[in-house]
Interface confidence: low
C-alpha cells in the first residue's frame, strides 16, 4: 500500500548473470559429398555471448556456412538477383542485400541459374530456413543465476537479491521458491505463457522483470524482489518483417596458410532484465 508519509526514491541497480547447462546437438554433416549424423557438445562458451547492459543471449538454433574464403564467386540467387548478361551487373556496386561487391560479370551459379559475380567471403551464404526443431532445444533445461545489487542513495541503503542463507541448489518457483534467483529457462517461458520449443526455432526476446517495493522504515522493514516474466518481441509479426531474433558471427581459422571462416547465423533468446521499484522511508 502507498505510504504517503514516506519519502520515496527510485531504485539504482546493477545486474550480473551466469548461465549454466550443456546441450548435445545432433545435425547432418556433409563431408566429401557424404552426409552423416554428427554429434557435438555445446557448453556455456559455445551458446552464450556477452551483451551490453542488463541482457544475456542464449543460442537455441543456428545455420552454418562453412569453409568461406575471400575470393570471387557468384552471389546467392535470391529473388531479383539473377542475371542473363553482364549488363545486369555493375562493377563496384554494393547491393545492401548482397554479400559482396559486384565485379561487373554475370556468371553461372549452378546449371540453371546465373548471378552477378561478387568479391566476397565465398561461397556466399545460402538463404536457409532455420532448422526445425531447434538444434539446441534442450536449452530449455539450462539455468541462469541472476545477481542483482540495488541501492537507494538518498536512504543510504544497499541490498541484493542473493542472501547468504539462500540454497544454491534451488530453482525459482513462483509459489514454492519465489526468492530463489536461479531460473530454469523453460520455466521462464512457461510463466510468460510461451512455448520455448517454438520460440527456440527463430529466436525471440524475453523480459525478466525484477520489482523492488521497499519499505525501509525500521519498524516495518521489507525489501525483497518480486520476479515476473513476459515476452518482449512481437510474436505475431508478418514473416516479411524478419521474425524472431538472430545475428551472425564468424569463427576464423587458417588452412594451408589461407584464412578461412565458418559463418554462423545464430538464432536464440535475448533475455532483458528490467529492474524497477522504489524505496520509501519516513
Amino acid at each position: 500500500s502507498d505510504k504517503l508519509y514516506q519519502r520515496k526514491e527510485p531504485v539504482i541497480s546493477s545486474v550480473h548473470t551466469k548461465v549454466k547447462g550443456i546441450a548435445e546437438v545432433t545435425e547432418n554433416v556433409t563431408e566429401g559429398g557424404v552426409t552423416k549424423l554428427g554429434h557435438s557438445i555445446f557448453d556455456t562458451a559455445d551458446y552464450t555471448f556477452p551483451l551490453q547492459g542488463n541482457s544475456f543471449f542464449v543460442m537455441t538454433n543456428y545455420v552454418k556456412s562453412e569453409g568461406q574464403v575471400q575470393t570471387l564467386c557468384p552471389e546467392y540467387p535470391r529473388r531479383g538477383a539473377q542475371c542473363s548478361s553482364d549488363r545486369r551487373c555493375k562493377k563496384g556496386w554494393m547491393d545492401p542485400q548482397s554479400k559482396g561487391i559486384q565485379t561487373g560479370r554475370c556468371v553461372p551459379y549452378d546449371k540453371t541459374r546465373k548471378t552477378c559475380e561478387v568479391s566476397a567471403w565465398c561461397p556466399t551464404e545460402e538463404e536457409k530456413e532455420a532448422p526445425r526443431p531447434a538444434l539446441l532445444r534442450s536449452a530449455e533445461n539450462f539455468t541462469v543465476l541472476i545477481k542483482n545489487n540495488i541501492h537507494f542513495p538518498g536512504h543510504n541503503y544497499t541490498t541484493r537479491n542473493i542472501l547468504p542463507t539462500m540454497n544454491g541448489s534451488c530453482t525459482f518457483h513462483k509459489t514454492w521458491d519465489p526468492q530463489c534467483s536461479i531460473f530454469r529457462l523453460g520455466d521462464i517461458f512457461q510463466e510468460a505463457g510461451e512455448n520455448f520449443t517454438e520460440v527456440a526455432v527463430q529466436g525471440g526476446i524475453m523480459g525478466i522483470e525484477i520489482y523492488w517495493d521497499c519499505n525501509l522504515d525500521s519498524w516495518s522493514h521489507h525489501c525483497r524482489p518480486r520476479y515476473s516474466f513476459r515476452r518482449l518481441d512481437d510474436k505475431n509479426t508478418d514473416e516479411s518483417f524478419v521474425p524472431g531474433y538472430n545475428f551472425r558471427y564468424a569463427k576464423y581459422y587458417k588452412e594451408n596458410n589461407v584464412e578461412k571462416r565458418t559463418l554462423i547465423k545464430a538464432f536464440g533468446i535475448r533475455f532483458d532484465i528490467l529492474v524497477f521499484g522504489t524505496g520509501g522511508k519516513f
Epitope: 549454466k20 545489487n149 539462500m166
Partner: nanobody, 123 residues
Framework: EVQLVESGGGLVQAGGSLRVSCAAS???????MGWFRQAPGKEREFVST????????VYADSVKGRFTISRDNAKDTVYLQMNSLKPEDTAVYYC?????????????????WGQGTQVTVSS
C-alpha cells in the same frame, strides 16, 4: 586464470585443531573467498565465506563457533582455522573464489575452485 591451491590438511584426533590455507596464483584481493567440503558419498556443502575486505563472514551452522575464516590480501591467501574438530568434519575441503566482492553460500556463485585438501578426524 586464477589457480587456487589448498594445503594444511591431514589426520587429526577428535577435539584437535587444524589450519588449512588457500593460496591464489593471481591477485584475489577484490574477490570473495569461500570454503566448501565434500564427505564421501555426500554432496559438496558450504562451510564458510569471507568478503573481499574481510568485513563480512558467514559460517554454516554445523561449524559456527568452532571454525574461523580469515584472509591476508597481501599474500593472496585465505585461511580456515578449525578447532574442536569432530569425526563428522572429515571431508575434502575445497577453496573457492568469486569475482563478486560480497559473500555467498552458493557454489553456483564461485568461478574458481581448488583441487581440495583431505581432512580426516579420527575418534
Amino acid at each position: 586464470e586464477v589457480q587456487l591451491v589448498e594445503s594444511g590438511g591431514g589426520l587429526v584426533q577428535a577435539g584437535g585443531s587444524l589450519r588449512v590455507s588457500c593460496a591464489a596464483s593471481a591477485r584475489t584481493g577484490s574477490y570473495s573467498m569461500g570454503w566448501f567440503r565434500q564427505a564421501p558419498g555426500k554432496e559438496r556443502e558450504f562451510v564458510s565465506t569471507i568478503s573481499w575486505n574481510g568485513a563480512d563472514t558467514v559460517y554454516a551452522d554445523s561449524v559456527k563457533g568452532r571454525f574461523t575464516i580469515s584472509r591476508d590480501n597481501a599474500k593472496d591467501t585465505v585461511y580456515l582455522q578449525m578447532n574442536s574438530l569432530k569425526p563428522e568434519d572429515t571431508a575434502v575441503y575445497y577453496c573457492a573464489g568469486s569475482i563478486t566482492s560480497y559473500v555467498s553460500t552458493w557454489q553456483h556463485d564461485y568461478e574458481y575452485w581448488g583441487q581440495g585438501t583431505q581432512v580426516t578426524v579420527s575418534s
